[in-house]
Interface confidence: low
């Protein structure tokens, strides 16, 4: 039987080592970071800029506002991601123009267009989550295999409580309106 | 018309503190995605990043230099004000500003200033 | 801190040539690179961003490719005004400059 190399959660998407999973229902910008935890994964951290445009190319293929692990709820006009770092200068070029612009403490910051957003975050919107993708032992060969029949469970520990992130996720990705200031 | 000026001593004495001012026309550096940067060339030598400044005041600093290095901004004046601590003979050169424009292609340096040559020496 | 290497750093060439300059990126850098012109005594001038992109007034002939970590500047054919330096810069992370690649009258 031929052994497949699976780096990836079934519906996760495989790239450059990291898993990624598009959400298909919707949370404010706290609950977003929970559900990410929940499934051992963070609420996506952006490292590249190769990362971005992948990323970036994600979100507006769909038409859909969605979430990053990035804010400045700490210290107002001060991005920083979720897991502490800040943001790198070059990574400022990403906002869209005009943005980031506070405008009625707009602290979390969104894909949006072919861009970043800031935005309140207590709106509910999509999100990205984010983990390493599975190692494979010298034998196997890494490469994204056909999707498995069955989701594979979430990690030990992960709560397993997201039934929304491993539910069969077959609706079109509808066009999802929203006015920015 | 879009132009960058930078003015300063042209000897500084080791071990002082030099003060280069840019004063710019043109655009604001009040505006989304621009910021203003310092750039230094020894004489038939490479170019080298020191400082940058954003619109929003966020200030980054070259890593071999961050501790002598102090960037700031006078938005109302259209200047940008770099001070350099501890000179050195080593640090003569041409100091250059130049601007990074606003939009989405990147954070590069679209104009520059003609440059003011600095002298290190006692 | 992202290193940048040019090569060659001199190049000897004639009117009408095709030149070709390299820069390489320690780590990769997207296509975050831009090239400059740099005449003696003078600051330098922008031909190139997002390494393929042409600002506004340079000639054509002038060209960028690569992404990642390898990058080149072409020049197609060329011209007496195009003896100079010309310097690669990464803005991916921070800036940096590369050495410098000086284009001389063969």
């Known amino acids: 039987t031929e052994r497949l190399c699976h780096p990836c959660p079934w519906e996760w998407t495989f790239f450059q080592g990291n898993c990624y999973f598009m959400s298909n229902s919707q949370r404010n910008w706290h609950d977003s970071i929970t559900a990410c935890k929940e499934v051992g994964a963070q609420l996506v951290v952006i490292k590249s800029a190769e990362e971005q445009n992948f990323l970036q190319l994600q979100s507006s293929r769909s038409n859909r506002f969605t979430w990053m692990g990035l804010s400045d709820l700490n210290q107002e006009g001060t991005w920083q991601w979720v897991d502490g770092s800040p943001l790198l200068p070059s990574f400022k070029q990403y906002w869209n123009r005009g943005e980031p612009n506070n405008v009625g403490e707009e602290d979390c910051a969104e894909f949006s267009g072919n861009g970043w957003n800031d935005d309140k975050c207590n709106l509910a919107k999509f999100w990205i989550c984010k983990k390493s993708a599975a190692s494979c032992s010298r034998d196997e060969e890494q490469f994204l295999s056909p999707a498995p029949a069955t989701p594979n469970p979430p990690p030990a520990g992960s709560g397993g409580g997201l039934n929304d992130i491993f539910e069969a996720q077959k609706i079109e990705w509808h066009e999802h309106h929203h006015h920015h200031h | 018309q879009v132009t960058l000026r930078e003015s300063g001593p042209a000897l500084v004495k080791p071990t002082q503190t030099l003060t280069l001012t840019c004063t710019f026309s043109?655009?604001?550096?009040?505006?989304?995605?621009?910021?203003v940067s310092w750039i230094r060339q020894p004489p038939g030598k490479a170019l080298e990043w020191l400082a940058l400044?954003?619109?929003?005041?966020?200030?980054y600093y070259s890593t071999s230099l961050k501790t002598r290095l102090t960037i700031s901004k006078d938005t109302s004046k259209n200047q940008v004000v770099l001070t350099m601590t501890n000179m050195d003979p080593v640090d003569t050169a041409t100091y250059y500003c130049?601007?990074?424009?606003?939009?989405?292609?990147?954070?590069?340096?679209?104009?520059w200033g003609r440059g003011t040559l600095v002298t290190v020496s006692s | 801190d992202i290193q940048m290497t040019q090569s060659p750093s001199t190049l000897s060439a004639s009117v009408g040539d095709r030149v070709t300059i390299t820069c390489r990126a320690s780590?990769?850098?997207?296509?975050?690179l831009a090239w400059y012109q740099q005449k003696p005594g003078k600051a330098p001038k922008l031909l190139i961003y997002?390494?393929?992109s042409l600002e506004s007034g340079v000639p054509s002939r002038f060209s960028g490719s690569g992404s990642g970590t390898e990058f080149t500047l072409t020049i197609s054919s060329l011209q007496p005004d195009d003896f100079a330096t010309y310097y690669c810069?990464?803005?991916?992370?921070?800036?940096?400059f590369g050495q410098g690649t000086k284009v001389e009258i063969k």
């Open positions: 130049a601007r990074t424009p606003s939009g989405s292609y990147g954070r590069y340096f679209d104009l």
């Open positions: 043109g655009f604001s550096l009040s505006t989304s995605g621009v910021s």
């Open positions: 400044i954003d619109w929003d005041d966020d200030k």
């Open positions: 780590q990769s850098i997207s296509n975050w």
């Open positions: 997002k390494a393929s």
């Open positions: 810069q990464q803005y991916n992370s921070y800036w940096t």
